[in-house]
Interface confidence: medium
Amino acid sequence: FERTRSLQDPCSNCPAGTFCDNNRNQICSPCPPNSFSSAGGQRTCDICRQCKGVFRTRKECSSTSNAECDCTPGFHCLGAGCSMCEQDCKQGQELTKKGCKDCCFGTFNDQKRGICRPWTNCSLDGKSVLVNGTKERDVVCGPSPADLSPGASSVTPPAPAREPGHSPQ
């Protein structure tokens, strides 16, 4: 018959906040200052993120979790975990290579971040434009033209929306 035995990795006993120190006979050593391990069984600790410059600290680093950053006023986060900080613009604008620029006609941005998006095309839903769009606000769609009382007029709807990924230049 074949006898099997399981050899447990001694490092698996090292909890979060420690690392398995090969230089000390695989003893669980605490993470050094400014480092952390968020899971058990780690052979190294990760260096804590430092929130410098336009980044500011939202959550301090601990032995078991990384620091979390956000952005100083006038900037906003981009990407996962606030990878980058980007300058705010005004509503009705978007950030371009040449700085903040007004949204092109037919597009809007109701926030200080992000890009100008096309006005809703009310006619795609068989509706009419009840309130015109602006650089800061989308159009408001109302009842379909057929539902309007005689003599009522509707504004000509804007051009169809862009495909995903495009931005007005």
Epitope: L78, G79, A80, G114, I115, P164, S167
Partner: nanobody, 115 residues
């Protein structure tokens, strides 16, 4: 439904080149990113490009990697030159929605740099 699908990963020798692609659908994206995660390491930022062409790179890839975007095809690219062993990782495409309030992720493509 938002979908980001990466392709172009593979095995390459040190000093070689690869071009990664990411096909995007389902939303308007203000910014698209490349991140990477090496075995046993934290995920790290590589590069991003905005819808109007502004780009940025991590220090470790500056001068070697080039990000680009074809808005007509809704596709993101990463041209990787002078590859090093330390570039070995799963490379992820990510994208922020038009309001920079949500980040979407692809499934990743493995790049292995080895002789």
């Amino acid at each position: 439904q938002v979908q980001l699908v990466e392709s172009g990963g593979g095995l390459v020798q040190p000093g070689g080149s690869l071009r990664l692609s990411c096909s995007a659908s389902g939303d308007i994206f203000s910014i698209m990113f490349w991140y990477r995660q090496a075995p046993g390491k934290q995920r790290e930022y590589v590069s991003h490009i905005t819808s109007n062409g502004r780009t940025n790179y991590a220090d470790s890839v500056t001068g070697r990697f080039t990000i680009s975007r074809d808005n007509s095809k809704n596709t993101l690219y990463l041209q990787m030159n002078s590859l090093r062993a330390e570039d070995t990782a799963v490379y992820y495409c990510a994208a922020d929605d038009a309001t920079n309030t949500r980040t979407y992720w692809g499934q990743g493509t493995l790049v292995t740099v080895s002789s």
